[in-house]
């Protein structure tokens, strides 16, 4: 009944020597105000987009079967840095972060923070800075302002600086991150730590006693066992996407989140494919209302951590690595030397209460079925600000188990699978390039999504 | 003055390995990045990755991955190409040149290093 | 990755005229492209970096424009030195690939 996702976003600078351009001044108090609705949604897209970015280059790269993390704490980490950035290098994470409005993105980034799914979410952001390191006040006071980071002197002793540090993380991430750095490099001057804890609880709850041992197939061939969540009657907003074809559903979450899974009907598919022609509308059209539905979905633990410095010099973020300009943040020049990232994720049927009302009345309504036995990708999103907050893909959510052949019977192979979507209808209402919206009708349709 | 002086013309056989180095002078080495560029005979140019020389670490074009390394003798202000296993279509000129953040631009290049493999 | 189409391949004009090289990018690269000329056995050299701003010791007669995905490189008044190789490369999302290059001759 519950997932919880720890991620956290260390950024860790060094000494650089001077070089330079003259600084730019964004006016003060321009970017004081509350976001208003129309800027909150171009904040929503413009994250979709990073989002899309950055996962696809990260899968790309990664040889693991799964995959998670939160492009909302990199965002972050990317735009308190943003704060002290000027000329080129502002402009460019502005880029990066498809920021149109550029210098409020951190003011709006961590007021729209501050109002995420009250108990669901806390976000802890931390400067350790280097002892006697001359750090403008003005960033100073920013940063506590809008990020609520208290700036900590380092000691100078690498153990007692990392035992410090992964205290900071382990408590930040109530327990759910408990060895972030294993080292400190000795030149370190200035390091941004960013810590999302979330915890969503289902609006609906799975009952414990319909677990059951099933099959998620990993290709054509083969199979692993998962321990799979089963509902009879789950309301859920769910559509069929065009082009390629994937099925998408709201899971909706207490706290105004949901979890959305893509599930794409190939198997041979891979991140940047799906995400190409992905955008936030795409994920929330209009119209499609939660209906009564038949749902399996495994139960899962994820974790990953990564390294994001190949990954965001290759978005376009080369310079800060090699040369910055963050004269916003001290005259003595400094080079982001690491960026490091972890997010976990827990999906089980454990938690509160269920909506039993909502269950009941939409029984009464005719049956479909959602099952998440393949490889998919997934999103969970703030509704309110519809911010992505985490984005992670699963090829096998039981690794260690042996793989099994598939019997020739069971086999939900793309024949058998695609066939049982001939009776399914298709909308021609077109959302972006190449990808239409097939949204479930009031009829009966054959089993959709279920292996037989 | 700036320069970028690459070592001289190399003659190889197809499966042996060759390195061409280009030494950085009249500025700060760290602070600028190192790209490397393949010019096959009468072709374009090609870009094969840089090399960020405050952290050493490399990023290479597709095509660029498995037999080429760069790497980094920083004290002497250095940058290296490495290739491997040489096959005859990597006969080319290979030149090193400088990346100015912020200019986003190679403003500076080596003289080139001419790589001939053949048996 | 981002493609980088140039065109002309190659091009003939007379000392005096005016021509445009073009180079249109797959992707939004903002205004980060660079332009280069090269003569035959030379190293590369920077003509224009940012798609407009001219490279200390360049000629006025060279201008660079554009931005997104399409650009060009004007050469006012061409002059003997002009006839060579340009070539355009995005410095965006990484490979910084350059386009196919032009082949400017003397008619």
């Known amino acids: 009944n519950q997932e919880q996702v720890s991620p956290l976003t260390l950024l860790k600078l060094g000494n650089q020597e001077p070089g330079g351009q003259t600084a730019l001044k964004s006016p003060p108090g321009v970017c004081s105000r509350d976001p208003t609705p129309e800027q909150t949604h171009r904040l929503a897209r413009a994250m979709m987009a990073f989002t899309a970015d950055l996962f696809s280059l990260v899968a790309q790269t990664s040889t693991c079967p799964n995959l998670i993390l939160s492009p909302l704490s990199v965002a972050l980490a990317l735009s308190h840095l943003a704060l002290g950035a000027q000329n080129h290098t502002l402009q460019r994470l502005q880029q990066v972060l498809h920021a149109g409005s550029g210098p409020c993105l951190p003011h709006l980034l961590s007021r729209l923070c501050q109002d995420l799914g009250p108990g669901a979410f806390r976000l802890a952001a931390r400067m350790y800075l280097q002892k006697g390191f001359p750090i403008k006040e003005d960033f100073l006071e920013q940063s506590e302002q809008l990020f609520g980071a208290k700036p900590v002197s380092l000691t100078g002793k690498q153990e007692d600086d990392l035992a410090n540090i992964n205290q900071w993380v382990k408590e930040a991430t109530e327990g759910k991150i408990q060895e972030f750095l294993s080292g400190l490099p000795e030149d370190t001057v200035l390091l941004l730590l960013n810590a999302i804890h979330f915890q969503g609880f289902w609006r609906n709850k799975f009952d414990p006693s319909l677990t059951q041992r099933d099959s998620f197939h990993l290709d054509e061939q083969f199979t692993v066992p998962v321990e799979m969540m089963q509902a009879r009657t789950y309301p859920l907003r769910w559509f069929l996407l065009e082009q390629p074809e994937i099925q998408v559903a709201h899971f909706p979450f207490k706290n105004n989140m949901s979890f959305v899974v893509l599930v794409p009907t190939h198997f041979e598919w891979n991140v940047s494919q799906v995400l190409a022609n992905l955008s936030w509308d795409t994920l929330h059209p209009p119209l499609v209302w939660e209906r009564p539905t038949k749902v399996r979905l495994p139960k899962l633990y994820l974790k990953h951590q990564m390294d994001l410095v190949a990954t965001l010099s290759q978005l376009g973020l080369q310079e800060l690595f090699q040369a910055p300009d963050l004269r916003g943040i001290s005259e003595q020049s400094l080079v982001v030397s690491g960026v490091q990232h972890q997010s976990t994720l827990e999906l089980s049927e454990v938690g509160v209460e269920a909506a039993a009302a909502t269950s009941i009345a939409m029984s009464r309504m005719s049956l479909s079925s959602f099952s998440v036995n393949r490889p998919f990708l997934f999103f969970i999103f703030e509704d309110t600000t519809g911010l992505p907050l985490f984005v992670g893909s699963v090829r096998n959510p039981n690794p260690s188990a042996p793989r099994e052949l598939k019997e020739q019977q069971d086999s939900p192979g793309n024949k058998d699978f695609l066939q049982s979507l001939k009776g399914f209808p298709r909308g021609d209402k077109l959302f972006g390039p190449d990808l239409k919206l097939v949204p479930p009708m009031e009829e009966d349709y054959p089993q959709f999504g279920s292996p037989k | 003055q700036i320069q970028l002086v690459q070592s001289g013309p190399e003659l190889k056989k197809p499966g042996e390995t060759v390195k061409i180095s280009c030494k950085a002078s009249?500025?700060?080495?760290?602070?600028?990045?190192m790209n490397w560029v393949k010019q096959a005979p009468g072709k374009g140019l090609k870009w094969m990755g840089w090399i960020n020389t405050k952290s050493g670490e490399p990023t290479y074009a597709e095509e660029f991955k498995g037999r080429f390394a760069f790497s980094l003798e920083t004290s002497a202000s250095t940058a290296n190409l490495q290739i491997k296993n040489l096959k005859n279509e990597d006969t080319a000129t290979y030149f090193c040149a400088r990346w100015v953040p912020g200019t986003y631009a190679m403003d500076y290049w080596g003289q080139g290093t001419s790589v001939t493999v053949s048996s | 990755d981002i493609q980088m189409t140039q065109s002309p391949a190659s091009l003939s004009a007379s000392v005096g005229e005016t021509v445009t090289i073009t180079c249109r990018a797959s992707g939004n690269i903002h205004n980060y492209l660079a332009w280069y000329q090269q003569k035959q056995g030379k190293s590369p050299q920077l003509l224009v970096y940012?798609?407009?701003t001219l490279a200390d010791g360049v000629p006025s007669r060279f201008s660079g424009s554009g931005s997104g995905t399409q650009f060009s490189l004007k050469i006012n008044s061409l002059q003997p030195e002009d006839f060579g190789s340009h070539y355009c490369q995005h410095f965006w999302t990484t490979p910084w690939t350059f386009g196919g290059g032009t082949k400017l001759e003397i008619k």
């Open positions: 009249g500025y700060t080495f760290t602070n600028y990045g």
């Open positions: 940012n798609a407009k």
